[in-house]
């Protein structure tokens, strides 16, 4: 299924932050990826190709992100308990056609050991 729960490890914790992995099929050339927390857009990244196959990357809601040929990673820092929620990767495929939207997601559990600046 291309929709539904992520069938891969979506959350990777390090240094009091989390990397949220949003995968897309590697044939996808042009797309928009949004990271949703509940129903709210936290971050987005749009990849388009212009004439001469020049690649353009744009963000309207900027987060620290990283693009590979089959995933976008969004990074959230200074984790606290308020970050616990459902997170969704909302992918809009523009190329190759036809247009398609897919949603995959999972619940981010926050445990004490993953918090940023615990008091010892």
């Amino acid at each position: 299924e291309i929709n539904g729960s992520a069938n891969y490890e979506m959350f990777i914790f390090h240094n009091g932050g989390v990397q949220i992995l949003c995968k897309y099929p590697d044939i996808v050339q042009q797309f928009k990826m949004q990271l949703l927390k509940g129903g709210q857009i936290l971050c987005d990244l749009t990849k388009t190709k212009g004439s001469g196959n020049t690649v353009s990357i744009k963000s309207l809601k900027f987060c620290h992100s990283q693009l590979s040929n089959n995933s976008v990673s969004f990074f959230l820092y200074n984790l606290d308990h308020s970050h616990a929620n459902y997170y969704f990767c909302n992918l809009s495929i523009f190329d190759p056609p036809p247009f398609k939207v897919t949603l995959t997601g999972g619940y981010l559990h926050i445990y004490e050991s993953q918090l940023c600046c615990q008091l010892k």
Partner: antibody, heavy 124, light 109 residues
Framework: QVQLQQPGAELVRPGASVKLSCKAS????????INWVKQRPGQGLEWIGN????????NYNQMFKDKATLTVDKSSNTAYMQLTSPTSEDSAVYYC?????????????????WGQGTTLTVSS | QAVVTQESALTTSPGETVTLTCRSS?????????ANWVQEKPDHLFTGLIG???NRAPGVPARFSGSLIGDKAALTITGAQTEDEAIYFC?????????FGGGTKLTVL
């Protein structure tokens, strides 16, 4: 081998909705888009819309948005197109065709396999 | 909505090379339109020939090839045969929808 099977003909009364079928075999049905195309006698081809069987995501030609509804039954590998309130303008041959785009397999981006078409006659 | 235009009819002779073209009302056809060529023979027999501008479908003879020529998509039949007599439709993708040309009736005399 890949096949898209459609009934040869359907007769429907004006105003009574009709559901056309397209049974797929010989490939992973849920992994490829199915398109529907209309051909009126002596005229060209009109794209109606498409559906991705895995999650039933659809796109429609605006001209058919209120006329056609695309669905699938994954258990029987069958795509359907329902036409509401048909009139004589809807009398035509309707084809289903596979768009060779899979998000998981090799891609060559062609409308490779076509059904033989269903001739729909709207008449009282 | 975009309009896709093809020659209405062409005539060729066996063994000759013939090129059919496909023009978009929105400007130059590009690889992002994923141009398709489909053959229609009598009794509603449709066969996909070319997709993604220049990918030949399995089982399609090598004499059929697709390309971009100038601002148009093109289907070239190199060494036409009598069985190539048919109607040829091109189709272009515009993001989330597909537009067909009016078709070219090819006669091989």
């Amino acid at each position: 081998q890949v096949q898209l099977q459609q009934p040869g003909a359907e007769l429907v009364r004006p105003g009574a909705s009709v559901k056309l079928s397209c049974k797929a075999s010989g490939y992973s049905f849920t992994s490829y888009w199915i398109n529907w195309v209309k051909q009126r006698p002596g005229q060209g081809l009109e794209w109606i819309g498409n559906i991705y069987p895995s999650d039933s995501y659809t796109n429609y030609n605006q001209m058919f948005k209120d006329k056609a509804t695309l669905t699938v039954d994954k258990s029987s590998n069958t795509a359907y197109m329902q036409l509401t309130s048909p009139t004589s303008e809807d009398s035509a041959v309707y084809y289903c065709t596979r768009w060779n785009l899979s998000y998981y397999f090799d891609n060559n981006y062609y409308l490779d396999y076509w059904g033989q078409g269903t001739t729909l006659t709207v008449s009282s | 909505q975009a309009v896709v235009t093809q020659e209405s009819a062409l005539t060729t002779s066996p063994g000759e090379t013939v090129t059919l073209t496909c023009r978009s009302s929105t400007g130059a056809v590009t690889t992002s339109n994923y141009a398709n060529w489909v053959q229609e023979k009598p009794d509603h027999l449709f066969t996909g020939l070319i997709g993604g501008t220049n990918n030949r479908a399995p089982g399609v003879p090598a004499r059929f090839s697709g390309s971009l020529i100038g601002d148009k998509a093109a289907l070239t039949i190199t060494g036409a045969q009598t069985e190539d007599e048919a109607i040829y439709f091109c189709a272009l993708w515009y993001n989330n929808h597909l537009v067909f040309g009016g078709g070219t009736k090819l006669t091989v005399l």
